[in-house]
């Protein structure tokens, strides 16, 4: 038994036929010693007397609000809730399995940007006697603060004969660092109580993995002279992180008729305009995705082909220009070839995802992520890799990136990747290895030396362990190169001579 909140206790029960249950001792919160009686819920039947009451809790009939009285006066309450465990698994009766992106997904979370603000939601078919409480933190062993509001009913839907209720909650990381590479996941814990049943649900994620931008705004069409083509332009959504030269998006533009089965024109671009073929009765749609990290695409923003005006949405500065003044020269060090670094780091992003696309869909945190990859260098908040830090002195950040590149280059050349199951030199991992080396050499020309970090001794004995470690390293590398690519894109846009 444990206390959920003041005067509310959760009894954990192994749930099987003829289970003995749990013996629970309730103590009346009063200085009185004599003349105390106990009742359950609205019943006037006296269950026992004395300052303590010992009960055997076996089923829901044994749970409820226990009240101690003296001479008709209520002294205190203790609400007992039951948490069922069947075959070693805690019950999940209250929430509906959303089955996306995998089975046993009860909580789903999304973030519109890297500010540390995110929304989680869940579904239930239960309409009454239902309460939720949400807690969150960054990391679990030494948790950093995340503040969540109250869960609210956000939508009601009819599904066949059933009504489905969607609840959602907004949370904000207390000291968010949008430009940093997350090393510890956000943990979200939801306590759900339906009548006398208690259940808890958890989700663990990095903000980068739950990013889903808002749709692009201000879609505008401009027919091109003497051509079937139209130029479509748009702007970054207002909710996306700034500056856009650092937090860049990529876009998919599609011309589609009313039916998915109709012909289409489709083009991908990093710009905020594209030229497409518009057909009568078709619509032009644009959606956005983080340019350097393969998280979710936004919903589509659409405008009909017939009208060449603009779609919903106000004005705002689009494009990926950095705005403001140019960054000044780096004190105490030569400036890197920003554009070359930008191109190579973007290539690294692509390679990191193609080295094993499955990595992006495997949940490896259950495998003890913190222990196996905690030696990996992360680009942290104080490393100066944010836009302001780059403006002040980019050398701190570049040194950190260089250390990381060398580290990963050594890891990819180590037994973890060279041992069984074997990978060929021209596999995506081989290309990734070569590109890491190439970028590190661009950053640190001959004769210029930064200290490098010691590579940890990770030598798994079994091929399956090696495979798992590869996944984890590549997953971590995907996050690292995304931050590096943002740094170089921003540098190329604002720091380049």
């Amino acid at each position: 038994i444990w206390e959920l909140k003041k005067d509310v206790y959760v009894v954990e029960l192994d749930w099987y036929p003829d289970a003995p249950g749990e013996m629970v001792v309730l103590t009346c919160d009063t200085p009185e010693e004599d003349g105390i009686t106990w009742t359950l819920d609205q019943s006037s039947e006296v269950l026992g007397s004395g300052k303590t009451l010992t009960i055997q809790v076996k089923e829901f009939g044994d749970a409820g609000q226990y009240t101690c009285h003296k001479g008709g006066e209520v002294l205190s309450h203790s609400l007992l809730l039951l948490h069922k465990k069947e075959d070693g698994i805690w019950s999940t009766d209250i929430l509906k399995d959303q089955k996306e992106p995998k089975n046993k997904t009860f909580l789903r979370c999304e973030a519109k940007n890297y500010s540390g603000r995110f929304t989680c939601w869940w579904l239930t078919t239960i309409s009454t006697d239902l309460t939720f409480s949400v807690k969150s933190s960054r990391g679990s062993s030494d948790p950093q603060g995340v503040t969540c509001g109250a869960a609210t009913l956000s939508a009601e839907r009819v599904r066949g004969d059933n009504k489905e209720y969607e609840y959602s909650v907004e949370c904000q990381e207390d000291s968010a660092c949008p430009a940093a590479e997350e090393s510890l996941p956000i943990e979200v814990m939801v306590d759900a109580v339906h009548k006398l049943k208690y259940e808890n649900y958890t989700s663990s994620f990095f903000i980068r993995d739950i990013i889903k931008p808002d749709p692009p705004k201000n879609l505008q069409l401009k027919p091109l002279k003497n051509s079937r083509q139209v130029e479509v332009s748009w702007e970054y959504p207002d909710t996306w992180s700034t500056p856009h030269s650092y937090f860049s998006l990529t876009f998919c533009v599609q011309v589609q008729g009313k039916s998915k089965r109709e012909k289409a024109d489709r083009v991908f671009t990093d710009k905020t305009s594209a030229t497409v073929i518009c057909r009568k009765n078709a619509s032009i749609s644009v959606r956005a995705q983080d340019r350097y990290y393969s998280s979710s695409w936004s919903e589509w923003a659409s405008v009909p082909c017939s009208g060449s005006g603009s779609s919903r949405g106000g004005s705002g500065s689009g494009g990926s220009g950095g705005g403001g003044s140019k960054l000044r020269a780096v004190p105490g060090g030569s400036s890197p070839a920003w554009t070359q670094c930008q191109q190579l780091s973007q290539k690294l992003c692509t390679l990191a995802w193609s080295a094993h696309p499955l990595v992006g869909h495997m949940d490896l945190r259950e495998e003890g992520d913190e222990e196996t990859t905690n030696d990996v260098p992360h680009i942290q908040c104080g490393d100066g890799c944010d836009p302001q830090g780059l403006r002040d002195n980019s050398q701190f950040c570049l040194q950190r990136i260089h250390q990381g590149l060398i580290f990963y280059e050594k890891l990819l050349g180590s037994d973890i990747f060279t041992g069984e199951p074997s990978l060929l030199p021209d596999s995506p991992v081989g290309q990734l290895h070569a590109s890491l080396l190439g970028l590190s050499q661009l950053l640190q020309p001959e004769g210029h030396h930064w200290e490098t970090q010691q590579i940890p001794s990770l030598s798994p004995s079994q091929p399956w362990q090696r495979l798992l470690l590869r996944f984890k390293i590549l997953r971590s590398l995907q996050a690292f190169v995304a931050v590096a690519a943002r740094v170089f894109a921003h540098g190329a846009a604002t720091l380049s001579p």
């Epitope: 990529t250 089965r261 012909k263 289409a264 083009v267 991908f268 073929i277 057909r279 696309p357």
Partner: antibody, heavy 118, light 107 residues
Framework: QVQLVQSGAEVKKPGASVKVSCKAS????????LHWVRQAPGQGLEWMGW????????EYAPKFQGRVTMTTDTSTSTAYMELRSLRSDDTAVYYC???????????WGQGTMVTVSS | EIVMTQSPATLSVSPGERATLSCRAS??????LHWYQQKPGQAPRLLIY???QSISGIPARFSGSGSGTEFTLTISSLQSEDFAVYYC?????????FGGGTKVEIK
């Protein structure tokens, strides 16, 4: 399944015109874009243009603008490509191809060899 | 127009080996890049679309990667039926253009 069957080989004199046909089957003719791509002997592929059979819209590669005409006959599910003022360097295999997506080529015809020789 | 350059022009590989073909665009084309295979006397066949998307019916040994200006087609373990000419094609802007092709031949 979707199939494209092209007309037979042609031999033409320089300055003449050629009209190659491409008969579609296995799908609703107006549901796919139709492209023409050519390949000179021992050479690579060269895109000529596309037509939307639904409305007759066309887009030609600048190189062929003014010399090529793409048409369709929806009653027979047939596309045509006419190339005028033929030169010896127009000697090539001409392929028609169809796709629901405009910018790449999914289903190809078997090709029609056009030889331009005096 | 966008110029597509493929390398090498010819690639000699033994059956069972891995083949890596490169395609470079004269300007950034995002992931608007498609790969085709052509055997002698046959029409080309689509292998990969939008840089890395696989086509149903195409063996899993064919994979594509890249974005921007540099792209790669990888054949993980060459089978006898894979010896052919491979073309890349950009769809970023009209006119649509192809690379000059890479001939994969038996070593």
């Amino acid at each position: 399944q979707v199939q494209l069957v092209q007309s037979g080989a042609e031999v033409k004199k320089p300055g003449a015109s050629v009209k190659v046909s491409c008969k579609a089957s296995g799908y609703t003719f107006t549901d796919y874009y139709l492209h023409w791509v050519r390949q000179a002997p021992g050479q690579g592929l060269e895109w000529m243009g596309w037509i939307d059979p639904e409305n007759g819209d066309t887009e030609y590669a600048p190189k062929f603008q003014g010399r090529v005409t793409m048409t369709t006959d929806t009653s027979t599910s047939t596309a045509y490509m006419e190339l005028r003022s033929l030169r010896s360097d127009d000697t090539a295999v001409y392929y028609c191809n169809a796709n629901k997506e405009l910018r790449y080529f999914d289903v190809w015809g078997q090709g029609t060899m056009v030889t331009v020789s005096s | 127009e966008i110029v597509m350059t493929q390398s090498p022009a010819t690639l000699s590989v033994s059956p069972g080996e891995r083949a890596t073909l490169s395609c470079r665009a004269s300007q950034s084309i995002s992931i608007n890049l498609h790969w085709y295979q052509q055997k002698p006397g046959q029409a080309p066949r689509l292998l990969i679309y939008f840089a890395s998307q696989s086509i149903s019916g195409i063996p899993a040994r064919f994979s594509g990667s890249g974005s921007g200006t540099e792209f790669t087609l990888t054949i993980s373990s060459l089978q006898s039926e894979d010896f052919a000419v491979y073309y890349c094609q950009q769809s970023n802007s009209f006119p649509l253009t192809f690379g000059g092709g890479t001939k994969v031949e038996i070593k």
